[in-house]
Interface confidence: medium
């Protein structure tokens, strides 16, 4: 790596990928192995994110880009650049402090995460249920009941009260 | 970091259709549900509906059904809306957001795209 | 599903405190804890302030805060300060299939 010969700041023409070196008279010298800086004029290098146990590495770290980690089968990403594993749960449950629990009456899921979401009310729109719902479907809506033929009913669930998992007001 | 990016302004003719796009990268597409919102000049903000990214299951505001169509390509981490017999009252700014939940709490819309103006003129 | 309700404007000095209200309905805002308030300024996308009714997302100022009584939601935004100015909406999750609906909008003057 050549000496920067900046009249200014000598570490600002160190490239990504290395550091100013300030033990060898501010020369540019590459990042150590797990390490990396992503711009230029750097006068350390991070360190990379190492992704272990519940993490598997999604990207290796380079000398210029950190390593960037997703989770292993059977759990999912939260947060920024996937800070969390989370567990994932079956289509029809949402994950609480309990571990995964059904979706209550009323609500469905057709996630292996997030949270349990109450049925469309169909009667809000004014149209009836044309398919029901289930833990891992919402309902159909269908036409309003008055567009039905004689005779014809429906049912339609009550909304649940709040949605599981969060506190009661 | 999460990034929505949508793409980029359109002029329609009355009766036209507009298909807006939204490609979404920082975080897992299909794990959370991609809303769209519109905005009229001057005005507030509207819900259109949602999309599962995984499922490729969709609601729409009810206002809006018959005309939009949501859809997805998860490989390519991108959410569409499309908006057909376009009349002068849907010139708006359309955005695509993100539903998210953690841990802590559900969000509703978080992070939003920039925004795409949707100008319909004959 | 019609649009929550909203004043339309609402101002202060700054370092005073101003409250924002939000009515809606039980099939939305009474019934869930799923309140959303959102700060747009112009030309650009809103961005989230309060979620769960009271809770703020990292990066926002605790100077703004969100409770709920019954079918009405509110925004407090205490100390006042010049960026603050801008439009303020209120969302809900509803039981309808028009799943998420917002406030008619509130514009925030500093004075």
């Known amino acids: 790596f050549e000496r920067t010969r900046s009249l200014q700041d000598p570490c600002s023409n160190c490239p990504a990928g290395t550091f100013c070196d300030n033990n060898r008279n501010q020369i540019c010298s590459p990042c150590p192995p797990n390490s990396f800086s992503s711009a230029g004029g750097q006068r350390t290098c991070d360190i990379c994110r190492q992704c272990k146990g519940v993490f598997r590495t999604r990207k290796e770290c380079s000398s210029t880009s950190n390593a960037e980690c997703d989770c292993t089968p059977g759990f999912h990403c939260l947060g920024a650049g996937c800070s969390m594993c989370e567990q994932d749960c079956k289509q029809g449950q949402e994950l609480t402090k309990k571990g995964c629990k059904d979706c209550c009456f009323g609500t469905f899921n057709d996630q292996k995460r997030g949270i349990c979401r109450p049925w469309t009310n169909c009667s809000l729109d004014g149209k009836s249920v044309l398919v029901n719902g289930t833990k891992e479907r919402d309902v159909v809506c269908g036409p309003s009941p008055a567009d039905l033929s004689p005779g014809a009913s429906s049912v339609t669930p009550p909304a649940p009260a709040r949605e599981p998992g969060h506190s009661p007001q | 970091q999460v990034q929505l990016v949508q793409s980029g302004t359109e002029v329609k003719k009355p009766g036209a259709s507009v298909k807006v796009s939204c490609k979404a990268s920082?975080?897992?597409?299909?794990?959370?549900?991609i809303h769209w919102v519109r905005q009229a000049p001057g005005q507030g903000l509207e819900w259109m509906g949602w999309?599962?990214?995984?499922?490729?299951?969709?609601n729409y505001a009810q206002k809006f059904q018959g005309r939009v169509t949501m859809t997805r390509d998860t490989s390519i981490s991108t959410a569409y809306m499309e908006l057909s017999r376009l009349r002068s009252d849907d010139t708006a700014v359309y955005y695509c957001?993100?539903?998210?939940?953690?841990?802590?709490?559900?969000?509703?819309?978080?992070?939003w795209g920039q925004g795409t103006l949707v100008t319909v003129s004959s | 599903q019609s649009a929550l309700t909203q004043p339309p404007s609402a101002s202060g000095s700054p370092g005073q405190s101003v409250t924002i209200s939000c009515t809606g309905t039980s099939s939305d805002v009474g019934a869930y804890n799923f309140v959303s308030w959102y700060q747009q300024h112009p030309g650009k996308a809103p961005k989230l302030m309060i979620y769960d009714v009271s809770n703020r997302p990292s990066g926002v100022s605790n100077r703004f805060s969100g409770s709920k009584s019954g079918n009405t939601a509110s925004l407090t935004i205490s100390g006042l300060q010049a960026e603050d100015e801008a439009d303020y909406y209120c969302?809900?999750?509803?039981?309808?299939?028009?799943?998420?609906?917002f406030g008619t909008g509130t514009k925030v003057t500093v004075l």
């Open positions: 969302s809900s999750y509803t039981s309808s299939s028009t799943r998420w609906v």
């Open positions: 957001a993100r539903d998210y939940y953690d841990s802590s709490g559900y969000f509703g819309p978080d992070y």
């Open positions: 920082g975080y897992t597409f299909t794990g959370y549900y």
């Open positions: 999309i599962n990214p995984n499922s490729g299951g969709t």
